[in-house]
């Protein structure tokens, strides 16, 4: 059995008080000092079984130098075994031993939970010499104890290579419950059960838990720590906390907000960054995510044209980055664009719609009926064609681009000419004789250069060899251009 020192119990209605027969103290006092000459202890505790020889860890000295008698075994005297006190109080406890004067250089060390206490600890050793023995009292004091001071303290003394160890003094620092696990904020699905956990420790134990939801107690009776609260589902945001009670009082956890997942708010600020003939680059600012991460977004595109069938094109894209290049659009067209994003709950409403336009496109067809013939008297090549049937979306014709490639004896040279939109014929100077000239023509608008016509080849003879027959693009269905010289 141990002798126990306790501070005075403060009854708390939910919990039993201290064990019968136990003592609590908050006095900063020297406990269980031995009666030694000239020293009066502040408190005395008689050993559990007075008069019984101590058979713990003792050192049995050899015979004296005279060889006449054996000295009694050395052992630390019994002291209080268990000190219970509140956090932030001061405590002082001690070990004492009487050592025959024949032993020199005795030192006492303090150990806590198997580790030696070194450095900045308040340990004092006092010596009280007598004729035959010296009473040694080693005191250990802690000011403003904390929970980390809890543990088993012992004294050790080395004599003649023997180690003498005291009984342990168990220090129990009591205080308000201390949370080791608190509820965490969560985002949950509406009307779906979920768990919250709360765990707190003493000492003193037991620690009992009350759950609080929106300021109302969930459990009418205390639950032992740890406690798991199964919340049966929520329809709106709620705040939870837990109260931990022990016989020192109550500690309240942080309050945590539990949010209900919902569909996101619609995106805002849809902006146009760049338009081309067939694409529009947009960006948007995501709305509130509804307490659930965005999964993806949908870009909805409607053509604004009284003649269009009003169908909506839908382009799915990742939620991040908040940007998307809409492709496969018609040139020179007006569109209404909206964005919607989704999370695990569902789709947001569509953002406010914005208007955007594509620019002019390049022509989609080449000029028709391209004819090429040589005008030797002027030393040039005459080219004629018909204006292509361009769509409105291609924009206004601004001219033509003529590509003529001259090939002779392994040499090839391409030249480009630009002519105005009112022309349907052009003349180019002969660059090389005894060579083949290959001509292609493309229509040009502000939107760009259209496709080139099929190549038409004409042979330019050496001087004096002239044939006025033209070369022209083939009639539809012919596989290759016809070359007439």
């Amino acid at each position: 059995a141990i002798t126990e020192a306790r501070e005075e119990a403060k009854p708390y209605p939910l919990f039993p008080g201290p064990l019968p027969g136990s003592l609590q103290t908050d006095h900063t006092s020297l406990l269980s000092l031995p009666h030694t000459s000239g020293y009066q202890p502040a408190l005395m505790f008689s050993p559990t079984q007075p008069g019984r020889p101590y058979t713990g860890n003792v050192a049995i000295p050899r015979v004296t130098s005279a060889g006449s008698k054996l000295l009694p075994p050395l052992a630390f005297k019994h002291t209080v075994g268990h000190i219970i006190l509140s956090e932030h109080k001061d405590v002082k406890f001690n070990c004492s031993i009487s050592v025959p004067n024949i032993y020199q250089d005795t030192t006492i060390s303090w150990w806590k939970d198997g580790k030696e206490l070194l450095g900045a600890h308040h340990a004092i050793t006092q010596f009280y010499p007598d004729d035959e023995v010296t009473a040694i009292i080693a005191s250990f004091s802690i000011t403003s104890v904390q929970r980390s001071d809890n543990g088993s303290y012992i004294c050790k003394m080395k004599i003649n290579n023997e180690e003498i160890v005291s009984d342990p003094i168990y220090i129990e620092v009591q205080g308000l419950p201390h949370f080791t696990k608190q509820p965490e904020s969560m985002n949950v699905t509406r009307n779906t059960a979920f768990n919250l956990t709360c765990q707190a420790v003493g000492p003193p134990e037991p620690v009992n838990i009350f759950w609080v939801q929106n300021s109302s107690r969930v459990n009418e009776q205390p639950e032992k720590s740890p406690s798991v609260l199964t919340v049966p589902g929520l329809t709106e945001m709620a705040v939870f906390s837990c109260e931990a009670h022990n016989d020192k009082g109550l500690t309240v956890s942080k309050g945590v907000q539990i949010n209900i997942k919902a569909i996101p708010s619609p995106p805002t600020e849809v902006s146009i960054h760049n338009s081309t003939a067939h694409s529009i680059l947009i960006s948007w600012v995501p709305g509130f995510d509804g307490y659930s991460p965005f999964r993806n977004c949908s870009v909805q595109v409607k053509e604004v044209d009284p003649l269009s069938n009003g169908s909506v094109m839908i382009f799915n894209t990742s939620a991040s980055p908040h940007m998307y290049q809409i492709k496969q659009l018609q040139a020179l067209a007006n569109y209404s664009i909206g964005v919607s994003c989704m999370n695990e709950i569902g789709w947001s409403a569509v953002s406010p719609w914005i208007l955007a336009s594509t620019t002019e496109g390049a022509p989609s067809v080449a000029p028709l009926n391209v004819t090429v013939f040589l005008n030797e008297s002027r030393d040039n090549v005459d080219i004629r064609w018909m204006k292509p049937l361009t769509k409105r979306q291609a924009g206004e014709l601004v001219g033509y681009r003529i590509s003529h490639v001259w090939q002779s004896a392994g040499i090839s040279k391409e030249l480009l000419e630009e002519v105005g939109q009112n022309n349907s014929r052009a003349q180019i100077s002969v660059q090389v004789h005894n060579a083949t000239c290959t001509v292609r023509i493309a229509a040009v608008t502000k939107g760009g250069v259209g496709p080139f016509s099929d190549p038409v080849k004409i042979f330019i003879p050496a001087h004096g060899w002239v044939d006025h027959a033209p070369s022209s693009t083939p009639a539809p269905g012919n596989a290759d251009p016809v070359l007439i010289i």
Partner: antibody, heavy 118, light 106 residues
């Protein structure tokens, strides 16, 4: 299995006292509160209050203070409702029920009819 | 205290006809519990915390609601469902019951 068994019907004269018992079994009695509910003839349910079986602390609803006393004997897992100075309007069926989280009454006694008549 | 008003006081139905029982609170409550009582019997737990079926209760019973408005629905009542139904709030003391709705056979 969880059971709440109440004492039998009582016929009392005005001014007398009655003590209704509610014996619990099938669970740890001190882990759950015991609620008391009154139902007058042809009327609805009326919550009277509850007793904390861990501390013995009673809580009374308005209108049930003074003459009504909740008590416990945890050694026999039993809750009691005592009504003193009985009046004719105390004639009712009295139910005990086990209280769990969110003040939900998950198990009920079979009810005790107390009749107050001269 | 929070007053719970149940409506209608009586609901006359043919078996199989959907029943919708309402319980309104005088101020917002966290959860609503529902109990069924048949003549001469103790109340029987039906729905816990607004929408959770008590043990052994068939799926034709369902609960919903939030704030001050709560509903108990019997999708297709069986003959044994004709009884009195009470709501009870959890939020603040005192715990209160509604006045009850009697579901009877038309």
């Amino acid at each position: 299995q969880v059971q709440l068994v109440q004492s039998g019907s009582e016929l009392k004269k005005p001014g007398a006292s009655v003590k209704v018992s509610c014996k619990a079994s099938g669970y740890t009695f001190t882990n759950y509160g015991v609620h008391w509910v009154r139902q007058a003839p042809g009327q609805g349910l009326e919550w009277m209050g509850w007793i904390n079986t861990y501390t013995g602390e009673p809580t009374y609803a308005q209108g049930f203070t003074g003459r009504f006393v909740f008590s416990l004997d945890t050694s026999v897992s039993t809750a009691y409702l005592q009504i003193s100075s009985l009046k004719a309007e105390d004639t009712a069926v009295y139910y005990c029920a086990r209280g769990v989280r969110y003040a939900y009454m998950d198990y009920w006694g079979q009810g005790t009819l107390v009749t107050v008549s001269s | 205290e929070i007053v719970l008003t149940q409506s209608p006081a009586t609901l006359s139905l043919s078996p199989g006809e959907r029943a919708t029982l309402s319980c309104r609170a005088s101020s917002s409550v966290g959860y609503m519990h529902w109990y069924q009582q048949k003549p001469g019997q103790a109340p029987r737990p039906l729905i816990y915390a607004t929408s959770n079926l008590a043990s052994g209760i068939p799926a034709r019973f369902s609960g919903s609601g939030s704030g001050t408005s709560y509903t108990l629905t019997i999708s297709s009542p069986e003959p044994e469902d004709f009884a009195v139904y009470y709501c009870q709030q959890w939020s603040s003391n005192p715990r209160t019951f509604g006045g009850g709705t009697k579901v009877e056979i038309k």
